[in-house]
Interface confidence: low
Amino acid sequence: ADRAALEELVRLQGAHVRGLKEQKASAEQIEEEVTKLLKLKAQLGQDEGKQKFVLKTPKGTRDYSPRQMAVREKVFDVIIRCFKRHGAEVIDTPVFELKETLTGKYGEDSKLIYDLKDQGGELLSLRYDLTVPFARYLAMNKLTNIKRYHIAKVYRRDNPAMTRGRYREFYQCDFDIAGQFDPMIPDAECLKIMCEILSSLQIGNFLVKVNDRRILDGMFAVCGVPDSKFRTICSSVDKLDKVSWEEVKNEMVGEKGLAPEVADRIGDYVQQHGGVSLVEQLLQDPKLSQNKQAVEGLGDLKLLFEYLILFGIDDKISFDLSLARGLDYYTGVIYEAVLLQMPTQAGEEPLGVGSIAAGGRYDGLVGMFDPKGRKVPCVGLSIGVERIFSIVEQRLEASEEKVRTTETQVLVASAQKKLLEERLKLVSELWDAGIKAELLYKKNPKLLNQLQYWEEAGIPLVAIIGEQELRDGVIKLRSVASREEVDVRREDLVEEIRRRTNQPLSTC
């Protein structure tokens, strides 16, 4: 009842303010009444808050539990080790950019950019990916040559199906090579990196689809699509991994007004996939072979396949004419890795179950930021870690495998009461020696409780202090794996722990 009365007061006060404005009352009078209205609305808001506030994370976001974080760290570790193995440096950029920096770089996806409310100064947007900020960084610092990786969160105002590992806030892991080099060598290395990472993560069988923007544009041209509509037709073609050709054709003809026979010509091309032999076949195609762009793209793909064979990954790569990644900035080779679901019946082709990594060449992006339009050729890849986290988590749940959420090597425990001081001294010695150690925060914990915690936490070792052991100058060291218990001299304890946990010498 109180709330209903308050709502009525707000309505009446609102009407009163509108009336004053229509009567052209003095600014002071209107301001006074607006202040009253705002106070009433604030009361209403507080009241609403008490009733309706639900504790949750915003739509499209999630918290990471220690278990999930442990999985994530392992995945990142595999990725970073690979990036470093290939000689990449690391950079970071702000989580928000000037709105102008991101404007006009993402084509139809631009509507998914988060704009920040104007704070009376610069117009800002949350970064949508790591590639455009990288191009801005290159242009701003006048860099023409760098091999870098960048792991950070990006933001998209999507309507994501979070169950399928898609979010509004998510991590991207990017590796890019900027600079003028001989054709297809950096591009081949990017594909090699993609294959190395996906193999190391052991998330299942995968396939990397490869195409070239120039082949797509050439194909659209010879099929009779007007230049102005290449991009919108591209976004239809890119859906072929999710829906049938019939549905794609219906969208192109029905929604996007493409002539049916133009759509059919496109269909003849985009339903083809294969290896280097398909590249060679298309180089002989009576229509495509007359298109300069398509011929350039096909020539580069032919060279790319030569390098992929040398890298030993050609069996993982498929030239797929339906690959038409949505982002506007790609100019050359484009690629996308999909996890394969093995066929249910013999003779069927494996099914792709979603993109887990992607990338391509974007030679024009840096030029968009350079005042003189100077171009820096770039090629890169992005690992879809959120999908990978989901896959790894599901796999761990299915196997009921225990995931350690800490790196503690040893628990310092005591067998009798009144040994807190000794535990504190010992744990401090271990920390100073660079050993990861813990103790229970109780003066006189029961030994059984300490051992129970040690086992549940999966800590490899427990160092037990007892009165007799103190007199003898030893510590009992017990292993969780073997259940064996040995007496170790106090001065040898650090070395013994290191030996048993294979930890190299390091101090903090």
Epitope: K111, V225, P226, T232, K256, G257, A259
Partner: antibody, heavy 122, light 110 residues
Framework: QVQLVQSGAEVKKPGASVKVSCKAS????????IGWIRQAPGQGLEWMGD????????NDNEKFKDRATMTADTSTSTAYMELSSLRSEDTAVYYC???????????????WGQGTLVTVSS | DIVMTQSPDSLAVSLGERATINCQSQ?????????MHWYQQKPGQPPKLLIK???NLESGVPDRFSGSGSGTDFTLTISSLQAEDVATYYC?????????FGGGTKVEIK
């Protein structure tokens, strides 16, 4: 029935801006594009660009790219065309017209507004 | 931009007689569709779509109006001119951005 109702005539000084509105009714606003066409006195038709309110997709005539801004407010089913840095040769009747289909590749314009006369004079 | 050349600039035809207007451009066709449309504009009024895709009569348009042609050459024909057909007729394509129109043909009664 389908109707496009445009805002009234405007007189502007050179260098100023004008914003013409086009309120649509009788159909689902987000299902069709709205094009803008102008006609100088005694002259032919000149297409300026269009906007597809369903996804704010725009096509522009390069000639007007830096001066014409097309927007749409889906809550009121109204399309707007703003032309800046006006000059005397911008004096014309400005029409909005409905494209046959949203994001249509090659749409004919099947319904037209009544036109808005914009006079640019010092 | 595609240039549309309309001819003649003006045309005087007796009531009940045939009127023919031509429009020439670079190709605005594919093998299935011709992206050429015809519009009628009466003095003081906005244009009105008469024929779309070269030959498809818009609903509500009298069948004395017809369109033909493909590729680069298109024709609008009024088989039996009526008094209410006095207007300026424009061809316009929607093949690529920007759409462009012909210069118009003014049809009068002789």
């Amino acid at each position: 029935q389908v109707q496009l109702v445009q805002s009234g005539a405007e007189v502007k000084k050179p260098g100023a801006s004008v914003k013409v509105s086009c309120k649509a009714s009788g159909y689902t606003f987000t299902d069709y594009c709205i094009g803008w066409i102008r006609q100088a006195p005694g002259q032919g038709l000149e297409w300026m660009g269009d906007i597809c309110p369903g996804d704010t997709y725009t096509n522009d005539n390069e000639k007007f790219k830096d001066r014409a801004t097309m927007t749409a407010d889906t809550s009121t089913s109204t399309a707007y065309m703003e032309l800046s840095s006006l000059r005397s040769e911008d004096t014309a009747v400005y029409y909005c017209a409905r494209g046959e289909e949203q994001l249509g590749l090659r749409n004919a314009m099947d319904y037209w507004g009544q036109g808005t006369l914009v006079t640019v004079s010092s | 931009d595609i240039v549309m050349t309309q001819s003649p600039d003006s045309l005087a035809v007796s009531l009940g007689e045939r009127a023919t207007i031509n429009c020439q451009s670079q190709s605005v066709s594919t093998s299935t569709y011709n992206y050429m449309h015809w519009y009628q504009q009466k003095p003081g009024q906005p244009p009105k779509l008469l024929i779309k895709y070269a030959s498809n009569l818009e609903s509500g348009v009298p069948d004395r109006f017809s369109g033909s042609g493909s590729g680069t050459d298109f024709t609008l024909t009024i088989s039996s001119l009526q008094a209410e057909d006095v207007a300026t007729y424009y061809c316009g394509h929607s093949y690529e951005i920007p759409w462009t129109f012909g210069g118009g043909t003014k049809v009068e009664i002789k």
